[in-house]
């Protein structure tokens, strides 16, 4: 009866050689796609000269297959019932699922020019940098191909900078041939309610990016959760993409290929200002851009990106405060298209379908010593791109799942 099913589930979700969970965990059977939409700036000269609103037009999707590589360096630790691993990164362009090629060009913010005065705040350094920006014929905006923008290009301005810095710039540079981790997660052998929960990341239990409890690594990596998920449970997970732990709450019941799943959604509350959600006070790390921590819907992850002025938000500034989106024209936030959700099968805790949506933005501020930025009259959080990473259990896998799990329970 139920006890037998529960016993079987508890056995099969453990992350060790021979279990159903382990096989799928090592290399996901789900095809995962990452779609990109690039924000093409329509009025670059007007912005640079007159500090006008930035007019953007999204272009996409440009689709890549990701997460197709198996976890590596898998090491079980029987002492503390954990398993450690790294997740290799790789992306393969999918032309048939894209509106164009990787060579398509876009007008976007010049990442190096925008970041330089933010990283080097000394006035004289900025005078030096300005001379190099001019020498390299760089300006506030640049035209780059999709491939360059995502995966990296040699920046002409940075190539002249005499400091020992990387001269290659790209939103996801470096990506291919890199790994995420080391992750160390509980295998659930001694306590099934801890299965897949992250014990440490890169050898640490905290991130060193945020003050107080915001710095904690909570929950799993969202690919699975401890079994027997209840609607009342808050699912906590860590996302290295956004350099923080976050949570999802129950939204609705869904039928996914005949499998009853719970759709958990990221609530607006997770992106709220400390004014609306006091728990978020430690995610507000600076007072100026955040208007004394009253702005919401954007997360400054600069500390996690070597001091670069990178801000993460939901696509089209969904759930963001009006002051954030006001300087940008052409954004159309939409809950259905732009929210993140996880469809979790409640008995096993496996995520059978998901859509992770996020937007990468760069802060650019007026800089009186940088000619390319001296006419700006206000700071802008400039959207560069947004992505939709999705995965759905395959038909075959779904049938197998129904037979082995949900069918038996019915």
């Amino acid at each position: 009866g139920d006890m037998l099913i529960e016993k079987t589930i508890k056995r099969e979700v453990v992350l060790e050689e021979g279990t159903t969970a382990f096989k799928n965990w090592v290399k996901t059977g789900t095809t995962v796609y990452r779609q990109f939409w690039i924000f093409d700036v329509q009025n670059p000269d007007d912005v640079a000269k007159n500090s006008s609103k930035i007019k953007v037009k999204q272009r996409g999707p440009y689709t890549y297959r990701v997460r197709y590589l198996a976890k590596e360096n898998i090491t079980q630790d029987p002492e503390d019932h954990t398993v450690s691993f790294v997740q290799p990164n790789g992306a393969i362009f999918e032309p048939s699922l894209s509106v164009g090629t990787e060579d398509d060009n876009f007008t976007v913010l010049n990442l190096a020019v925008a970041a330089a005065p933010h990283i080097y705040q000394n006035s004289f350094v900025q005078v030096v940098l300005n001379s190099l920006i001019k020498k390299s014929k760089s300006s506030m905006f640049q035209t780059r191909s999709l491939k360059e923008l995502l995966w990296g290009y040699k920046d002409p301005f940075l190539s002249l900078v005499p400091y020992p810095i990387s001269t290659t710039v790209g939103v996801f540079y470096p990506y291919n041939d890199t790994v995420d981790g080391v992750y160390k997660v509980f295998n659930g052998k001694d306590n099934i309610s801890k299965v897949a929960i992250i014990e440490s990341y890169k050898g640490k239990r905290n991130l060193s990016y945020w003050p107080s409890y915001c710095d904690m690594i909570n929950g799993t990596d969202a690919a699975s959760f401890p079994p027997f998920v209840e609607k009342s449970r808050t699912l906590r997970f860590f996302s290295s993409d956004i350099c923080r732990s976050i949570y999802a709450v129950f939204g609705s019941e869904i039928d996914l290929k005949g499998i009853p799943v719970y759709r958990f959604v990221l609530p607006a509350n997770a992106f709220a200002s400390p004014l609306q959600n006091p728990d978020n006070h430690c995610f507000c790390t600076e007072k100026v851009i955040s208007n004394n921590c009253t702005s919401y819907g954007v997360l400054d992850i600069g500390k996690c990106k070597e001091g670069k002025p990178v801000y993460i938000s939901l696509p089209h500034f969904l759930h963001a405060s009006p002051d954030v989106s006001e300087p940008i024209e052409g954004l159309h936030p939409n809950e259905d298209e732009h929210r993140t959700y996880l469809d979790v099968e409640p008995i096993t805790g496996f995520t059978l379908q998901f859509a992770k949506r996020l937007q990468v933005n760069i802060l650019v501020k007026p800089a009186r010593k940088i000619e390319a930025l001296k006419n700006l009259k206000r700071p802008y959080i400039v959207p560069i791109l947004w992505l939709n990473e999705t995965g759905t259990i395959g038909d075959e896998k779904a049938e197998m799942f129904k037979t082995q799990v949900t069918g038996k329970i019915k």
């Epitope: 006035s123 004289f124 350094v125 005078v127 030096v128 001379s131 400091y163 009186r368």
Partner: antibody
Framework: QVQLQQSGAELVMPGASVKMSCKAS????????MHWVKQRPGQGLEWIGA????????SYNQKFKGKATLTVDESSSTAYMQLSSLTSEDSAVYYC??????????????WGQGTLVTVSA | ETTVTQSPASLSMAIGEKVTIRCITS??????MNWYQQKPGEPPKLLIS???TLRPGVPSRFSSSGYGTDFVFTIDNMLSEDVADYYC?????????FGSGTKLEIK
């Protein structure tokens, strides 16, 4: 208070080199760049270049590249300037100077007393 | 390189008179102009920094104006202690360049 103490006057032969010093006190030496400025007798001022005291990165006026070499010794909070292949044109008072960063930048807010270099056979 | 042309080269004024010195730059430097006073045997002293900002402790009779390429330095009521050489410095771009100086004397 901020003080920049420069080394004494130098009388040098044409073709020779000279190295002068600028010892800083009253502030954290590596927090500020050090500039050097030339003033020929009865004439105007010329910016020679500057050095980042924290990592020894230098920025020179093209006119003085090959003539002046800027260095620092963090342990003694001292900046140095060496002038090579001296000619009578190099006879001048040389100043070290430091900026002040507040709400706006004050360039060369603090100056050393100057080192007089005389090039003569 | 931005050239800074300073005028006049010398100026003889009576105590209490208004003194005006002008600097013209070869390129647009916004308001990145600075003004220095140098007395004999001393290093220069910064009076006014970028943005026409009077430095702390500098008497209010000193002022400056200008933007772009044309800049003016003014002493409202000249005192005997104001006898000195005055220099402008553009700090917009490298290399920083000074004006050739103005020698202010008492008439």
């Amino acid at each position: 208070q901020v003080q920049l103490q420069q080394s004494g006057a130098e009388l040098v032969m044409p073709g020779a080199s000279v190295k002068m010093s600028c010892k800083a006190s009253g502030y954290t030496f590596t927090d500020y760049w050090m500039h050097w400025v030339k003033q020929r007798p009865g004439q105007g001022l010329e910016w020679i270049g500057a050095i980042d005291t924290s990592d020894s990165y230098t920025s020179y006026n093209q006119k003085f590249k090959g003539k002046a070499t800027l260095t620092v010794d963090e342990s003694s909070s001292t900046a140095y300037m060496q002038l090579s292949s001296l000619t009578s044109e190099d006879s001048a008072v040389y100043y070290c100077a430091r900026d002040y960063y507040g709400s706006s930048t004050a360039w060369f807010a603090y100056w050393g007393q100057g080192t007089l270099v005389t090039v003569s056979a | 390189e931005t050239t800074v042309t300073q005028s006049p080269a010398s100026l003889s004024m009576a105590i209490g008179e208004k003194v005006t010195i002008r600097c013209i730059t070869s390129t647009d430097i916004d308001d990145d102009m600075n003004w220095y006073q140098q007395k004999p045997g001393e290093p220069p002293k910064l009076l006014i920094s970028e943005g026409n900002t009077l430095r702390p402790g500098v008497p209010s009779r000193f002022s400056s104006s200008g933007y772009g390429t044309d800049f003016v330095f003014t002493i409202d009521n000249m005192l005997s202690e104001d006898v000195a050489d005055y220099y402008c410095l553009q700090s917009d771009n490298l290399p920083f360049t000074f004006g050739s100086g103005t020698k202010l004397e008492i008439k």
